[in-house]
């Protein structure tokens, strides 16, 4: 039997610092190009290898970015979000909301009336 | 992803001029950053010109500002590089690349996912 599959959200600020090839990510999302329907957030699509977030290694792919230093990402064209990274000094705070997948047992398994006590 | 071909290098005298491009296949190639780079002889590649996807925003290594020139058409999914004033130490091969939303700045690599196979460019 399938089990139901709920997804956990939680937040996180992780502080990055700016490595000799940059923050070492990709991402996707905003106004123009929505990543999720009727979200036009910024999520990350890729963590590169070796490069700062992989080696903090708490930002995931898939992550949704919150903010970056305090500067909300909602509602911003994919290119702004993109130049507001390229822009955010060497130091660098980002909001993140990660979404675990939780698989709930089997539907039906010991519901009401199951003997199985 | 986008496939790449560059096309244009040669063999030129030192001073002359030369026009590089890369043609793309693939979707939304528009929405791409395109870069080109070189590796001479014995040296790290490194980065030439880059223009950004949306906005169309050009960016040089300061060895080749003021002769060269990046541009693209996005009608022919193609990036051409401009080289004027070709100089010895221009010689190379070059490279072009295609990458998407990567948050670090276009001089960089890492920065992009697609790379050509290359195109000789010798300055005599």
């Known amino acids: 039997m399938n089990g139901r599959v709920d997804y956990l959200v939680t937040e996180e600020e992780i502080n990055l610092t700016r490595g000799p090839s940059g923050l070492g990510f990709n991402i996707v999302g905003g106004t123009d190009q929505q990543y999720v329907s009727n979200d036009s957030g910024i999520y990350v699509s890729r963590i590169k290898e070796n490069g700062a977030a992989a080696l903090d290694g708490r930002l995931q792919e898939g992550d949704k970015i919150l903010s970056v230093n305090g500067q909300d990402l909602k509602n911003l064209l994919h290119q702004d979000a993109v130049d507001l990274f390229r822009n955010a000094g060497y130091a660098v705070s980002l909001r993140v909301q990660h979404r675990l997948q939780v698989q709930n047992g089997p539907i039906g398994h010991r519901g009401e009336g199951d003997p199985s006590g | 992803h986008v496939q790449l071909v560059e096309s244009g290098g040669g063999l030129v005298q030192a001073g002359g001029s030369l026009r590089l491009s890369c043609a793309g296949s693939?979707?939304?190639?528009?929405?791409?950053?395109m870069g080109w780079f070189r590796r001479a002889p014995g040296k790290e590649r490194e980065f030439v010109a880059a223009?950004?996807?949306?906005?169309?925003?050009?960016y040089y290594a300061d060895s080749v500002k003021g002769r060269f020139t990046i541009s693209r058409d996005n009608a022919k999914n193609t990036v051409y590089l401009q080289m004027n004033s070709l100089k010895p130490e221009d010689t190379a091969v070059y490279y072009c690349?295609?990458?998407?939303?990567?948050?670090?700045?276009?001089?960089?690599?890492?920065?992009?996912?697609?790379w050509g196979q290359g195109t000789q460019v010798t300055v005599s």
């Open positions: 693939g979707r939304s190639f528009s929405s791409y950053d």
């Open positions: 690349a295609a990458g998407f939303g990567s948050v670090d700045g276009l001089e960089y690599s890492g920065s992009y996912d697609d």
């Open positions: 223009i950004s996807g949306s906005r169309g925003s050009t």
